[in-house]
């Protein structure tokens, strides 16, 4: 739940949600730093860094949901993302190791800032859900499918495969955030 008073103005809150999703959709925020840190910044390897179909709800699926259902799906999916991010963070090199290998410490910072960014967005989603629940003209909830389970990685036999899985997952996350932004823009 959000701490402090949620904004009671629909337009203001929607504008903030749009700003947050716009800022989070770009791959320079998460995927690109991950690729550099994991040594996957090679054209041949980048080809393998494509989202697995079905890992995240499609834009078409999101558009088909009612507003409440969309927010529920978004909240649940971001919850899954947080779990995966925690897993990815555990496998990242430490700051001192990065410096020793000549990699950019700012890349690690960007990866670490993703989690609080998502938490902040989720709090605004909670505020918007509250606002919709309190409005007289709220539509009935149309629950979203496919967001209750975290996008699970395929069993990885080695560290390299896990890196690629992480890459594919983050690619899907950015595509998903782009879709979310497009849905919000139609509200």
């Amino acid at each position: 739940a959000a701490i402090g008073s949620c904004s009671k103005e629909y337009r203001v809150l929607l504008g903030q949600l749009q700003k947050q999703t716009d800022l989070m959709q770009d791959t320079s925020r998460l995927l690109d730093p991950y690729i550099r840190i994991q040594g996957l910044d090679v054209p041949k390897l980048r080809e393998h860094c494509r989202e697995r179909p079905g890992a995240f709800p499609s834009e078409e699926t999101l558009r088909g949901l009612g507003r409440r259902g969309f927010l529920q799906t978004l909240n649940a999916t971001l919850g899954c993302v947080l779990h995966r991010l925690a897993d990815l963070e555990q496998r990242l090199p430490k700051a001192q190791d990065l410096e020793r290998s000549g990699l950019n410490i700012e890349d690690l910072e960007k990866l670490q800032m993703a989690r609080p960014n998502i938490l902040g967005l989720r709090n605004n989603i909670y505020c918007m859900a509250q606002l919709l629940d309190n409005s007289d003209t709220a539509e009935p909830t149309k629950a979203g499918r496919g967001a209750s389970q975290p996008p699970t990685p395929t069993p990885a036999s080695d560290a390299f495969q896990r890196k690629l899985e992480g890459c594919r997952f983050l690619h899907g996350y950015h595509r998903f955030m782009h879709s979310v932004g497009r849905v919000f823009s139609k509200w």
Partner: antibody, heavy 119, light 113 residues
């Protein structure tokens, strides 16, 4: 209405400690980050660091790392900037500002807290 | 760190005339996939905190008069005040938020000629 209200002006002596505050209202405090920005007399803006009040995750500018401490108490929607030992060169206006995600632009600013350090 | 350099340091413009401020970043602040430039402009009037005018290089913050516009991409950006008003006398700053640490330009002072 979104508001960031900062604590009042301070006059301190070198070596003294200080903690200034920034209270947010009119929005969900844990939906955004809070940045601190320094403006020395007649000079430009310098970013000091940022905190996510939800879990107090903090990032400092290398120029300010170890010089100040940024903290937050989400239960009272307040962020803090503190010094353990002030120097004359810390004399400046300090602003807190709200940030949608990190890093990003600063969309709402506090009115500023003037800190004067003089013997 | 990304270094932001503004020009000129100050300019004097007649009321109703156009004012143009430039900002150059030491590396590109253009996003990889979204075509968003992570650049903002602020206005600071004497004795007041800065105020956000423009973000994403060209998007006006709500409530900002349409005489203010932003343009540019990559490393070169411009803030334009199409018809200077007396209340526009201020210092203007650009800021990049492509990466931390967030950095500001040194500021451009706009005065009435």
């Amino acid at each position: 209405e979104v508001q960031l209200v900062q604590s009042g002006a301070e006059v301190k002596k070198p070596g003294e400690s200080l903690k200034i505050s920034c209270k947010g209202s009119g929005y969900s405090f844990t939906s955004y980050w809070i940045s601190w920005v320094r403006q020395m007399p007649g000079k430009g803006l310098e970013w000091m660091g940022i905190i996510y009040p939800g879990d107090s995750y903090t990032r400092y500018s290398p120029s300010f790392q170890g010089q100040v401490t940024i903290s937050a108490d989400k239960s009272i929607s307040t962020a803090y900037l503190q010094w353990s030992s002030l120097k004359a060169s810390d004399t400046a206006m300090y602003y807190c500002a709200r940030v949608p995600v990190s890093p990003a632009y600063l969309d709402y600013w506090g009115q500023g807290t003037l800190v004067t350090v003089s013997s | 760190d990304i270094v932001m350099t503004q020009s000129p340091d100050s300019l004097a413009v007649s009321l109703g005339e156009r004012a143009t401020i430039n900002c150059k970043s030491s590396q590109s602040v253009l996003g990889s996939s979204s075509n968003i430039n992570f650049l903002a402009w602020y206005q600071q009037k004497p004795g007041q905190p800065p105020k956000l005018l423009i973000y994403s290089a060209s998007t006006r913050e709500s409530g900002v008069p349409d005489r203010f516009s932003g343009s540019g991409s990559g490393t070169d950006f411009t803030l334009t005040i199409s018809s200077l008003q007396a209340e526009d006398v201020a210092v203007y700053y650009c800021q990049q938020y492509f990466s931390t640490p967030i950095t500001f330009g040194q500021g451009t002072k706009v005065e009435i000629k």
